[in-house]
Interface confidence: low
């Protein structure tokens, strides 16, 4: 029996590197570490709400305190971070809000990446009055523990006056610290008395110590790094998505598959087709077809639109998404009408998602 | 044509490290694919093992996870597997092999294999 | 992991067979199902992909089909050049695992 190839019988081959996928984005809400958060559910009626965080059940604990629609987390940590739905369960239907947690010192020490306010911390002394260094802004070096998801930006400030204006250099873990301790290096804006390293790695864990001299005296000041490991997550799907569809022979159809995914998702969409006038062959299995796929000879593999429907294009459609943690897949149904019958959307039915590890 | 080659020693010693290496040509590894270890023992049983993606990432077998690395050399378009603390059930024919995605259900170019024996 | 159960364990067939391999996945792996063809010596060949596709190359005389969790790979009419080990593998969920083989030799 004859087997379906892919669109048009695409090989496998990419015609080019795969790029980052552009996936939906959700809403962020950005904590320090040890503050609390709340969150309200951005849903109405909803009757009955329950939560997850990337995919998973989310229960109330200690710090997890679930109260009607809101959520609050309290002491927030850079594992509280990821993708977190709520969804209200109303009697005829269910529907899924979706925005993400992100704890981080991104921008350490207190201050702005563009250091707006840093020139008032270059502090110009009188020159007949000699001083020893001494810090200009302790409140902005309170927080000595730092900890980062990867690939996020650090910056250590020590704003700091004397006369004659002091020098300032930095030491990793008590020692010198050189450019080509790191990839990518650091960035020492003088100025604004502040190290700067870009897209942390894990191996930038440590102690950085900021000398502060003059001929009149020395200070220092340390600040403990700790990078956090991102877990990455396998792709979400958006409940409610795709949603089933019904439309008159000759109309023209859309389905709609938003994806969350922090690494790049790769989308399927596949249909469960006929095949001499069975769905199923002689093994009592269904004959499938895949329709769309992300990376070949596609554009926008998150939606598939169908054009001038026959009764033959009716049935489940199923859209699944695979990075390298795993997959998921959730379908639709396409009913198609005779023409003298006006189409209606159809209530949003969920497929039950198919969350694999 | 992509052409895949593994390479490295023969027989190791138990509690000894192995490292080996897959040598790819006509494609870079940094377009695209995931660059997978596969291990074959005797008797034919096939195991994965793990892969590294176009990008860097990695996926490893819970199973290994442990003892095995798998890493790459983007100058010379070649990636790595490394695992430690080898024992006589580590003896097999490796392959290296790539494969489109994760649920793309194929590996579609295959190395021709490097046996392995571990003994002492 | 999921375990695939790959049977028979060894096939004896004459030129001109047909024949049946079947794999069963201890559970649902969609349609991420591939086979695969290993001659002595030689690594493993793609054959079918998704389940039911052909590979690039492959004559038409390899088919596959199932879904879920019951898979099968039929050769309409076996040729000498046939005589190998088949393989099923799963790339459904990680671990992606292989079925044991079946080794196809002339009665």
């Known amino acids: 029996r004859p087997s379906f190839s892919l669109v048009e019988d695409t090989t496998l081959e990419p015609e080019e590197p795969p790029t980052k996928y552009q996936i939906s984005q959700p809403e962020v809400y950005v904590a320090a570490p040890g503050e609390s958060l709340e969150v309200r559910c951005l849903l109405k009626d909803a009757a009955v709400i329950s939560w997850t965080k990337d995919g998973v059940h989310l229960g109330p604990n200690n710090r997890t305190v679930l109260i009607g629609e809101y959520l609050q987390i309290k002491g927030a940590t850079p594992r509280d971070s990821g993708l977190y739905a709520c969804t209200a369960s109303r009697t005829v239907d269910s529907e899924t809000w979706y925005f993400m947690v992100n704890v981080t010192d991104a921008i350490s020490s207190g201050d702005d990446e563009d250091d707006t306010d840093g020139a008032e911390d270059f502090v110009s002394e009188n020159s007949n009055n000699k001083r020893a260094p001494y810090w200009t802004n302790t409140e902005k070096m309170e927080k000595r523990l730092h900890a980062v998801p990867a690939a996020n930006t650090v910056k250590f400030r020590c704003p700091a006056g004397g006369n004659p204006m002091p020098t300032m250099r930095w030491l990793k873990n008590g020692k010198e610290f050189k450019q080509e301790h790191r990839i990518g290096g650091y960035k020492v804006r003088n100025q604004h008395w502040s190290l700067i390293m870009e897209s942390v790695v894990p191996s930038d864990k440590g102690n950085y110590t900021c000398v502060v001299e003059n001929e009149y005296g020395s200070i220092n000041h340390t600040y403990h790094l700790d990078v956090v490991e991102r877990s990455p997550h396998r792709p979400i799907l958006q409940a409610g998505l795709p949603a089933n569809a019904s439309t008159v022979v000759g109309g023209d159809v859309e389905f709609v598959c938003k994806v969350y995914s922090d690494a790049q998702p790769h989308i399927q969409w596949i249909k469960h087709v006929e095949k001499n006038g069975s769905k199923y062959g002689p093994d009592g299995l269904p004959y499938l077809k895949v329709l769309k796929h992300s990376g070949i000879n596609s554009s926008n593999a998150e939606v598939l639109a169908l054009f001038n429907v026959t009764e033959a294009d009716a049935g489940e459609y199923i859209c699944k998404v695979s990075n390298y943690i795993g997959q998921a897949n959730q379908s639709a149904w396409l009913t198609v009408l005779p023409k003298q019958q006006a189409p209606g959307r159809e209530k949003e039915i969920t497929a039950s998602p198919d969350y694999l590890e | 044509d992509v052409h895949l080659q593994e390479s490295g020693p023969g027989l190791v010693k138990p509690s000894q490290s192995l490292s080996l290496t897959c040598s790819v040509t006509?494609?870079?590894?940094?377009?695209?694919?995931?660059w997978n270890w596969i291990r074959q023992f005797p008797g034919n049983k096939l195991e994965w093992m793990g892969y590294?993606?176009?990008?860097?990432?990695?996926n490893y077998n819970p199973s290994l996870k442990n003892r095995l690395s798998i890493t790459r050399d983007t100058s010379k378009n070649q990636f790595f597997l490394q695992l430690s603390s080898l024992t006589t059930e580590d003896t097999a024919t490796y392959f290296c092999?790539?494969?489109?995605?994760?649920?793309?259900?194929?590996?579609?170019?295959w190395g021709t294999g490097t046996t392995v024996t571990v003994s002492s | 992991s999921i375990v695939m159960t790959q049977t028979p364990k060894i096939l004896l067939v004459s030129a001109g067979d047909r024949v049946t391999i079947t794999c069963k996945a201890s559970?649902?792996?969609?349609?991420?199902v591939a086979w695969y063809q290993q001659k002595p010596g030689q690594s493993p060949k793609l054959l079918i992909y998704?389940?039911?596709n052909r590979y690039t190359g492959v004559p038409d005389r390899f088919t596959g089909s199932g879904y879920g969790t019951d898979f099968t790979f039929t050769i309409s009419t076996v040729q000498a050049e046939d005589l190998a080990v088949y393989f099923c593998?799963?790339?459904?969920?990680?671990?992606?695992?292989f079925g044991s083989g079946t080794k196809l030799e002339i009665k």
């Open positions: 092999a790539r494969v489109y995605y994760y649920g793309s259900g194929n590996f579609d170019v």
């Open positions: 006509g494609y870079s590894i940094t377009s695209g694919y995931y």
């Open positions: 590294i993606t176009y990008d860097g990432s990695n």
């Open positions: 559970q649902s792996v969609s349609n991420d």
């Open positions: 998704y389940a039911s």
């Open positions: 593998h799963q790339d459904h969920t990680s671990p992606f695992t």
